[in-house]
């Protein structure tokens, strides 16, 4: 990778300047696509900010950009005007250029912000040169709010600054009035005034009457050293405009503005709702607007005025519907900074906000909300609720339109029916069960983002706190013991201080769950079970008769049990015990305790019993070590001798 270009950027004070290929140009020996030449901002600017023309200019600082985006002029540096005057300021950006597999290259971009530069959007080289409005035949003070050269002083090191001043030399005097300093008129023999006199409010313009034509004066400003000595330093020659207004003139009153809302890539007329003024003594055609700063999401155009952007228009253009905003592909909001004048009063700043609406929004639901059973609550995340349109909508607001039946939503521990995407992203929105009679719930929300809404249903399920056996296959035709090695809700018991209960909802398809008689004295056969407890599992009182799939050749099969698990003070949960089965294999060590094996296997072993043994298992079968796991079928027989 190599980096060409000047790596310096000259920026006018308070302006936006795009980075260009003259400033920053990366290339690689492999001729890499500029899209793949990636800059990472290691240290951002201190005097302004870097942002992307197509993205939110008010959002977070830019972190990455590509050489292609530099070529397109989409990477912008904006200088932010400081409160204190300056003549020249320097900023730096530290960047890292990367394009694997090449080694990264570090780069520093130097930014010079200077009043010396010729700036079309800031024609004056002074800190302020705003001009003056004066009523006809009257006087007005020219203060540093209108004319201020303190940025020239800022070029002097601060210890010596107090000994310096700025000398203004009037090179062309006002034609319709006169300038006075401390009530003394300026004239060709005495054409000077100082920045210090301006700052002290000693400069006055007195209008001579006889009309409201424009007036003004030209001047040259330069630094003056101690005792009035001329010193080398910045200087400028400029004009100061003086507008004379009719004494009876009432200034226009801007009216409250409603933001313009439109979808991206579309066009919308601007009406009086966006731009209007009350001015009884001016016609709409006399009220002029000028664009001081335009947003990046589109431009203003006049019907019949060509396709390009306009920077000047009148209230008459607005009132007649001739002015429109044309949105580009950007999806971010923006603001026009305008100045408005009736030609006789000082220009007033106005703004026009443009909000780019999504044509539609969608609530993305990636997964149901899973609530851990022992907690009974869970935080919502972007997995459950996230609004997207033409971009992600971080400002989305949600309102419950149908609440959950078995719980409620809380923010900060308080029940709530309204919350934001930000609160979801922060993990602050919690669903908590309040009624522990259902293993699932749902609620419906209405999402609102930038004036568009959409609804969605969030499903809630409870995740059982249950350890489920996940071993190898079980033998068809056998009865195996259901104990905590197969199903264990012991942790749920500890967490709730209760004995968890199971209810069989479904399955197995081939087989059944039975209660095993404790001893020979108990009445014979196994009883079918639909409900049991953790205690039953721990006591070894339960068996699972593993059936053979009917109507097909013997072979491996799959089966499952669906259970509902209940405990005190927590919602119930549905869990599955999925298991594989296979024809019984005497030589195979099964990892569960078998209470009986298929009849055919027993007959082969020379044990002429026709009934399935359902009595109490022998010591081996009931020990923690599974019986058949020890040594195949003979060991099983030994273990079950006494039954």
């Amino acid at each position: 990778l190599s980096l060409k270009g000047s790596q310096t950027l000259t920026v006018c004070p308070g302006s936006v300047q795009p980075l260009s290929s003259q400033t920053l140009r990366a290339s690689s020996s492999a001729g890499t696509d500029p899209q793949l030449l990636l800059y990472r901002v290691v240290r951002g600017p201190q005097l302004g900010r870097l942002f992307h023309a197509q993205q939110d200019s008010t959002g977070e600082a830019l972190v990455n950009f590509t050489q292609a985006e530099v070529y397109a002029g989409n990477i912008l540096y904006e200088h932010e005007m400081p409160p204190e005057p300056f003549w020249e300021a320097h900023d730096t950006l530290e960047l890292q250029l990367s394009s694997p597999p090449a080694r990264d290259v570090a780069a520093t971009l130097a930014v010079a912000v200077s009043f010396e530069a010729a700036c079309p959007q800031h024609p004056s080289h002074l800190w302020k040169n705003k001009g003056l409005w004066v009523p006809e035949g009257q006087r007005a003070r020219i203060t540093v709010a209108a004319l201020d050269a303190s940025n020239l002083l800022a070029s002097v090191p601060s210890p010596q600054r107090s000994e310096h001043d700025v000398l203004f030399q009037v090179t062309q005097f006002p034609s319709r009035g006169q300038l006075l300093v401390s009530e003394e008129p300026l004239h060709a023999g005495q054409p000077h005034f100082l920045q210090s006199q301006l700052a002290a409010g000693q400069l006055v313009y007195a209008h001579g009457g006889g009309g409201t034509q424009q007036d003004g004066f030209h001047f040259r400003a330069h630094l003056q050293g101690p005792a009035g000595a001329s010193v080398a330093g910045p200087q400028t020659s400029e004009a100061f405009a003086i507008t004379v207004r009719d004494v009876n003139e009432r200034p226009p009153q801007p009216q409250a503005s409603v933001p313009l809302r439109l979808t991206r890539g579309s066009r919308a007329p601007i009406s009086r709702a966006q731009l209007s003024v009350v001015d009884p003594d001016s016609a709409p055609g006399e009220i002029e607007y000028e664009v001081q700063r335009a947003p990046h999401n589109g431009f203003l155009s006049l019907v019949g005025g060509g396709l390009g952007p306009v920077t000047r228009f009148t209230q008459a253009d607005v009132d007649s519907g001739r002015l429109a905003f044309v949105a580009n592909g950007s999806s971010v909001a923006g603001i026009f900074q305008l100045s408005m004048s009736d030609g006789a009063s000082p220009p007033l700043p106005m703004s026009l906000a443009v909000d780019i609406l999504p044509s539609a929004i969608e609530v993305q639901l990636r997964a149901p909300l899973e609530v851990p059973q022992a907690l009974g609550r869970s935080s919502l995340s972007q997995q459950q609720l996230r609004v997207v349109s033409d971009r992600e909508e971080p400002e989305a607001a949600y309102r419950l339109i149908q609440g959950p039946q078995y719980g409620h939503l809380l923010v900060g521990g308080r029940p709530t029916s309204a919350f934001s995407q930000f609160q979801i992203d922060q993990g602050e929105v919690v669903f908590a069960f309040t009624n522990f009679s259902s293993s699932h719930d749902h609620f419906r929300v209405l999402a609102l983002a930038r004036g568009v809404n959409a609804s969605a249903v969030v499903n809630v399920t409870v995740r059982a706190l249950l350890h489920v056996w996940a071993g190898g296959p079980w033998p068809q035709g056998a009865t195996l013991r259901l104990d905590p090695t197969v199903l264990d809700a012991g942790e749920l018991a500890n967490r709730t201080g209760s004995v968890p209960r199971f209810r069989l909802l479904e399955g197995p398809r081939h087989g059944r769950v039975v209660r095993v008689p404790r001893a020979r004295t108990e009445p014979g056969g196994s009883q079918l079970v639909e409900q049991f407890t953790q205690q039953d599992l721990e006591d070894g009182r339960l068996g699972l008769e593993v059936g053979r799939p009917e109507g097909r050749a013997p072979g491996p099969a799959g089966d499952s049990l669906t259970l509902e698990l209940w405990a005190q003070g927590v919602p119930p949960a549905v869990a599955s015990l999925d298991f594989a089965t296979e024809p019984y294999n005497a030589a195979r060590p099964y990892s569960v305790a078998l209470l009986s094996v298929p009849e055919a296997a027993r007959t082969e072993a020379g044990k002429p019993e026709s009934s399935t043994p359902t009595g109490e298992p022998g010591p081996m079968a009931s020990s923690p070590e599974p019986a058949v796991a020890k040594g195949g079928f003979l060991s099983f027989l030994e273990a079950n001798m006494f039954s």
């Epitope: 009974g376 419950l400 029916s417 309040t434 009624n435 003070g569």
Partner: antibody
């Protein structure tokens, strides 16, 4: 800040239906989550009667469920309590509340 | 139903004392606990919600703590206006239930 105000008769005859209304100001009953009725027998603790939510769904205390109905009128921003077949044991101060804020309470005496 | 048991049922204390009231739930309530203050003839006022969050406008001398089944309301330095009855209430499981109340009296 939400304010709640109970209204209704202070005396109800045994076996009749107690009816109270709560008027909410400073907030909408379609935006707050729970709108509760709670009562307090003289010199005793608090007993939750039931609630109606922002979307109109209800939940009642099982001990009173067969006799309680809570409804709402969104146009008036009010919610109401009806307790049927009252006895002297239903004599209490009845409060409406959203848990953050409570009405000042109204004493209902059941007596012939 | 979840039973809420407050202790003590009453206590006597002086201005400036540190006072602690406990509330025990018959089973875990996940922190969903409110504390209210009630003065004679008045409605209860929320002091603390979600175990330890101070309601707006409540003086910082009130604090709450606890988890699982055991919860505490502490008044760090009792003021004359704090003499009242205090109630705890759970909103973890329906029906919502209250403790029987603790009366704080002047010694």
């Amino acid at each position: 800040q939400v304010q709640l105000q109970e209204s209704g008769p202070g005396l109800v005859k045994p076996s009749q239906t107690l009816s109270l209304t709560c008027t909410v100001s400073g907030g909408s009953i379609t935006s707050g989550y729970y709108w509760n009725w709670i009562r307090q027998h003289p010199g005793k603790g608090l007993e939750w009667i039931g609630y109606i939510t922002y979307d109109g769904s209800n939940n009642y205390n099982p001990s009173l469920k067969s006799r309680v109905t809570i409804s709402r009128d969104t146009s008036k921003n009010q919610f109401s309590l009806k307790l049927s077949s009252v006895t002297a044991a239903d004599t209490a101060v009845y409060y409406c509340a959203d848990f953050d804020y409570w009405g000042q309470g109204t004493l209902v005496t059941v007596s012939s | 139903d979840i039973q809420m048991t407050q202790s003590p049922s009453s206590l006597s204390a002086s201005v400036g004392d540190r006072v602690t009231i406990t509330c025990r739930a018959s089973y875990g309530i996940r922190g969903y606990l409110n504390w209210y203050q009630q003065k004679p003839g008045k409605a209860p006022k929320l002091l603390i919600y979600y175990t330890s969050s101070l309601h707006s406008g409540v003086p910082s001398r009130f604090s709450g703590s606890g988890s699982g089944t055991d919860f505490t309301l502490t008044i760090s330095s009792l003021q004359p206006e704090d003499f009242a009855t205090y109630h705890c209430q759970q909103y973890s499981a329906l029906p919502w239930t209250f403790g029987q109340g603790t009366k704080v009296e002047i010694k």
